[in-house]
């Protein structure tokens, strides 16, 4: 592959990494297999500046990030490490509730309106934003 | 030009191997992500797999995981997929097709002729 | 994984005539919902992607509508060429993009 050296039409550079917001919905594992298609994860949250971006593109609607724990620990998609990086949970959240009445509890993160966090059932239809980094050794995504 | 253009179908017996290319032109080849679709004889149409535009990631369908293997050469612009263990039920006209991604909604925009994979002793 | 249908298997129409074609999915899909003609021995071509959006080069005189579960594909005058046969698509499971099983349209 050859390095990635700007963004792609229709997406958003910011801190050397570039974003598409979707104004759609989808499950959580098809909102991370877009995202995989475009050579791209959904986005991985590393510091309170990139909260505040994310959160001012997202405006106040329940998004998709690339954070769950379906399969014990919570992980992020990149593999970048949970335990130590950023987080900005809601209140009592995550709670991996199982009162929603459709099976199993909370595995899948996203943002709530207010920009915090909350886990919620994978399967619920939200927007998604993916990100992929500049300067990477891989194609670009395809074009929009 | 835009085009697609499959190669490498024939017969082949129960368990053997097959490898499919596509051959690309007329748009920028590594800025899509890729498809093989097939069709049975008299049939209708059967997702097979996906690989991104750069390659580094692939999906299957549950019908041929383990056996097929998709892949890419974009200094080629060309597609392939690896078939392994070719049961009967593989005979085919396999198609590729490149994805197109609008707002969100995605959708198979250029096919190629396709060619046919008959599997039988 | 999603199951689309498609409750005509064929149908028999006019030169002029207005065909309406239906799809439904066995979940909502929201409008991911493509649709696409395919002709005796060649490859299928896209007609309509997102449920509504006409693709690039497609006569207007093809239309899709609908959301959720169920969808409806629309020749508003059925030409000699448009003779073929007709799926829909869904594209939700990103990439599981499973098909109907298609609907024939032939000369009445």
């Known amino acids: 592959g050859s390095e990635r050296t700007c963004c792609p039409v229709n997406w958003v550079e910011h801190e050397r990494s570039c974003y598409w917001f979707s104004r759609s919905g989808k499950a959580w594992a098809d909102a991370d297999n877009y995202c995989r298609l475009e050579d791209a994860h959904l986005v991985v949250v590393t510091s309170w500046e990139e909260q505040k971006f994310v959160q001012h593109h997202i405006g106040p609607v329940n998004t998709w990030m690339g954070l769950h724990d379906q399969n014990g620990p919570w992980k992020w998609v990149d593999g970048t490490d949970y335990e130590t990086g950023f987080k900005n949970w809601r209140p009592e959240q995550p709670d991996d509730w199982y009162g929603h009445g459709l099976g199993g509890g909370e595995d899948c993160a996203h943002f709530t309106d207010d920009g915090r966090w909350n886990d919620d059932v994978c399967q619920r239809p939200y927007r998604w934003v993916c990100e992929t980094e500049l300067d990477k050794a891989s194609q670009e995504p395809p074009l929009l | 030009e835009v085009q697609l253009l499959e190669s490498g179908g024939g017969l082949v017996q129960p368990g053997g191997s097959l490898r499919l290319s596509c051959a690309a032109s007329?748009?920028?080849?590594?800025?899509?992500?890729m498809n093989w679709v097939r069709q049975a004889p008299g049939k209708g149409l059967e997702w097979v797999s996906a690989i991104s535009g750069g390659g580094g990631n692939t999906f299957y369908a549950d019908s041929v995981k383990g056996r097929f293997t998709i892949s890419r050469d974009n200094s080629k612009n060309t597609l392939y997929l690896q078939m392994n263990g070719l049961r009967a039920e593989d005979t085919a006209v396999y198609y590729c097709a490149s994805r197109i991604a609008v707002a969100g909604s995605e959708a198979f925009a250029i096919w190629g002729q396709g060619t046919l994979v008959t599997v039988s002793s | 994984d999603i199951q689309m249908t498609q409750s005509q298997s064929s149908l028999s129409a006019s030169v002029g005539d207005r065909v309406t074609i239906t799809c439904r999915a066995s979940?909502?899909?929201?409008?991911?919902l493509n649709w696409y003609q395919q002709k005796p021995g060649k490859a299928p071509k896209l007609l309509i992607y997102g449920a509504s959006s006409l693709q690039s080069g497609v006569p207007s005189r093809f239309s899709g509508s609908g959301s959720g579960t169920d969808f409806t594909l629309t020749i508003s005058s059925l030409q000699p060429e448009d003779f073929a046969t007709y799926y829909c698509?869904?594209?939700?499971?990103?990439?599981?993009?499973?098909f109907g099983p298609g609907t024939k349209v032939d000369i009445k």
């Open positions: 007329g748009f920028t080849f590594s800025n899509y992500a």
């Open positions: 698509q869904q594209s939700y499971s990103t990439p599981l993009f499973s």
């Open positions: 979940q909502s899909i929201a409008s991911y």
